[in-house]
């Protein structure tokens, strides 16, 4: 089964420059019909999978990957990939997460404005997806096996 799958997009909320200890959420977006979103680190050997997929708009689905307390080890490039059965998509562009020491100074904002990589169309409807599988959480990081396009 072959389908031309659009590349996913990746963004970060509230931004890509995050104070140490603060939270950040990566948002991966793709077409409707995605079963699994994967957030990859700079190498493809470390990733998180989630099947908690919601419908961001009539033509777009999304998944969110939250880091509650950012550490220096979380800094670096991230990208998304998704599984729309029976095929994996190409990767999104990289999004660089910067982690900064909290200075507490009045002139330094806590975060920079939200940033994204890949297609930048924002969903007009953020309602919960009726198609999302129930009670599927983030998977532990584990080794990635290179996929074969089918």
């Amino acid at each position: 089964q072959e389908e031309d799958l659009p590349r996913p997009s990746i963004s970060a909320e509230p931004g890509t420059v995050i104070p140490l200890g603060s939270h950040v959420t990566f948002v991966c977006r793709g077409p409707v019909g995605v079963q699994t979103f994967r957030l990859e680190r700079e190498s493809r050997s470390t990733y998180n999978d989630t099947e908690d997929v919601s419908q961001a708009s009539p033509s777009e689905s999304e998944a969110r990957f939250r880091i509650d307390s950012v550490s220096e080890g979380n800094a670096g490039p991230y990208r998304c990939i998704y599984y729309k059965p029976p095929k994996w998509s190409e990767q999104s562009d990289y999004l660089e997460l910067l982690v900064k020491e909290t200075s507490g100074g009045p002139d330094s904002p806590d975060t920079e404005p939200g940033s994204s990589a890949g297609p930048t169309q924002r969903p007009s409807d953020n309602s919960h997806n009726e198609h999302a599988p129930a009670s599927q959480g983030l998977k532990a990081e584990h080794l990635y096996h290179h996929h074969h396009h089918h």
């Epitope: 089964q1 389908e3 409707v32 019909g33 079963q35 699994t36 999978d49 989630t50 099947e51 599984y83 059965p85 029976p86 994996w88 009726e130 198609h131 999302a132 599988p133 129930a134 599927q136 998977k139 990635y144 096996h145 290179h146 996929h147 074969h148 089918h150």
Partner: antibody, heavy 110, light 109 residues
């Protein structure tokens, strides 16, 4: 690339059985593996599948009695419990829906 | 409960003719996730059509799928003797659940 089921046999009512789906030529990390059954002379019935992430999804009637899991990098198992005569069928596994095994026959009888 | 109904349990037509098999779902399939399978006795099913209307590789263009929402059809034109088989529809639903239709036997005269 192939899939093949094994483990089908005669089981007495109330018993349990584990079927194995062995794949070759592709990675379980990249595909759903579906389980389907077909009673003699009847239609196809979806049981459930395991996703690349390792999550199991089941038909409502199969929840509780049927469990799908990855046993190794090349095998997926279907564990069935509290078997009755109505579970007598040929059991198929499939890579998503495009590549099927020949099936394995499970007979529940005393 | 998810129910896929194939209204005709059997249809027949002469060689060179056309048959249409219908499949009705009790609820909308997700993202046009509707497939058609062909099964011959003693063999596993073979996927012919997926995503409602896309032909699987190697399937002749005599087969075509159409429909949306809850109503779908498989049309086989220029019937050949080799098309004699049972055909099943399969729907994919919210939350990644699937259901098969009851099957329609195609008899080629």
């Amino acid at each position: 690339q192939s899939v093949k089921e094994s483990g089908g046999r005669l089981v007495t009512p109330g018993g349990s059985l584990t079927l194995t789906c062995t794949v070759s030529g592709f990675s379980l990390s990249n595909y759903n593996i579906q389980w389907v059954r077909q009673a003699p002379g009847k239609g196809l019935e979806w049981i459930g599948f395991i996703s690349p992430a390792g999550n199991g999804y089941y038909a409502s009637w199969a929840k509780g009695r049927f469990t799908i899991s990855k046993a190794s990098s090349t095998t997926v198992e279907l564990k069935m419990t509290s078997l009755t005569a109505s579970d007598t069928a040929t059991y198929f596994c499939a890579r998503h829906w495009d590549l099927w095994g020949p099936g394995t026959l499970v007979t529940i009888s005393s | 409960e998810l129910v896929l109904t194939q209204t005709a349990s059997s249809v027949s037509a002469a060689v060179g003719g056309t048959v249409t098999i219908s499949c009705q779902s009790s609820q909308s399939v997700y993202s046009n996730y509707l497939s058609w399978f062909q099964q011959k006795p003693g063999q596993p099913p073979k996927e012919l059509v997926y995503w409602t209307s896309t032909l699987q590789s190697g399937v002749p263009s005599r087969f075509s799928g159409s429909g949306s929402g809850t109503q779908f059809t498989l049309t086989i034109s220029d019937l050949e003797c080799d098309d004699a088989a049972t055909y099943y529809c399969l729907g994919g639903y919210s939350g990644w659940f699937y259901a098969f239709g009851g099957g329609t036997e195609v008899v080629v005269k």
